[in-house]
């Protein structure tokens, strides 16, 4: 059974992940982002179901494509800290949160999503899990 300290650690990790995803979304939605229209043409894949930490496997699998799209937006008006580091940090958190005991084959929804929809989906996921822990 999860201890209060492990629950607290999970909560902090989720909050960190949430902040990183929100930072990316804010950068993309920034009215000064000249690349928004182009960035919205890239397709991302969403999980059919995302209700447990193990479902973060579906986020992990889309981090590389996310990094590639973010690389396109590194302009003066779009300030993200080094994309590679940011995605790497997210990846570390995701790996810790989902655990490595069970390898889940992610089931994806049929419809694709824009980068904004994709980020919003995972932000909602983090908020939802955090609310169950508090």
């Amino acid at each position: 059974a999860p201890t209060s300290s492990s629950t607290k650690k999970t909560q902090l990790q989720l909050e960190h992940l949430l902040l990183d995803l929100q930072m990316i979304l804010n950068g993309i939605n920034n009215y000064k982002n000249p690349k928004l229209t182009r960035m919205l043409t890239f397709k991302f894949y969403m999980p059919k179901k995302a209700t447990e930490l193990r479902h973060l496997q579906c986020l992990e699998e889309e981090l590389k494509p996310l990094e590639e799209v973010l690389n396109l937006a590194q302009s003066k008006s779009f300030h993200l800290r080094d994309t590679k580091d940011l995605i790497s940090n997210i990846n570390v958190i995701v790996l810790e949160l989902k655990g490595s005991e069970t390898t889940l084959m992610c089931e994806y929804a049929d419809e694709t999503a824009t980068i904004v929809e994709f980020l919003n989906r995972w932000i909602t996921f983090c908020q939802s899990i955090i609310s169950t822990l508090t």
Epitope: Y45, P65, Q74, M105, C106, Y108
Partner: antibody, heavy 121, light 113 residues
């Protein structure tokens, strides 16, 4: 039709810089990324980096970071690759290339004819 | 960086016979979301730039003869020339287009036996 025409061969001294041009035609240069790939004599292909001519955003291979500069002039539909601190192992054919789609990792469907840069004292 | 390993280094095949080139990547090139493998094949003839033959492991580039086909998934891929023609003499390269930096195999030289 899509065409990428590069500048002519160059002979350079070690320590100097070279600037290769790549003029795009048959499409709007701001619609796609331009990549640079080099090939040493008798060797394989090595990706150097890309530029988005629309806003000058670039990505470089770690190996060339700090030594290569990619720029573009949209008024002349020309992209440039400048490589500094040249050494003999930089002797290669340098290609500009354009992908099939506006995507940093799409494969390269269109290539320039190549520019041979020889570094020799 | 993803390492691409090609085999064999060179290959001599009789005209009209099948030529098979292998390519192995150091990590999977399969994106589960769309079930696509991000691998391309190029042909390069002496003094010419490379020419894109196949991308997404098996999608033929427009104008490429259908004797060229690609297969494989994950980390193991194959380019097949079903019936070798004289004009197919060239060096063939695989390339992953999954992540930056895109990386190439060392090439396979195809000759006529």
């Amino acid at each position: 039709q899509v065409q990428l025409v590069q500048s002519g061969a160059e002979v350079k001294k070690p320590g100097s810089s070279v600037k290769v041009s790549c003029k795009a035609s048959g499409y709007s240069i701001t619609d796609y990324l331009i990549h640079w790939v080099r090939q040493a004599p008798g060797q394989g292909l090595e990706w150097m980096g890309w530029i988005d001519p629309e806003d000058g955003v670039t990505a470089y291979a770690q190996k060339f970071q700090g030594r290569v500069t990619l720029t573009a002039d949209t008024s002349t539909s020309t992209a440039y690759m400048e490589l500094s601190s040249l050494r003999s192992e930089d002797t290669a054919v340098y290609y500009c290339a354009r992908s099939l789609d506006y995507d940093p990792i799409y494969p390269f469907a269109y290539w320039g004819q190549g520019t041979l840069v020889t570094v020799s004292s | 960086d993803i390492v691409m390993t090609q085999s064999p280094d060179s290959l001599a095949v009789s005209l009209g016979e099948r030529a098979t080139i292998n390519c192995k990547s150091s990590q999977s090139l399969l994106r589960n979301g769309n079930q696509k493998n991000y691998l391309a094949w190029y042909q390069q003839k002496p003094g010419q730039p490379p020419k894109l033959l196949i991308y997404y492991a098996s999608t033929g580039q427009s104008g490429v003869p259908d004797r060229f086909s690609g297969s494989g998934s994950g980390t193991d891929f194959t380019l097949t020339i079903s019936s070798l023609q004289a004009e197919d003499v060239a060096v063939y390269y695989c390339q992953q287009h999954y992540v930056t930096p895109p990386t190439f195999g060392a090439g396979t030289k195809v000759e006529i036996k």
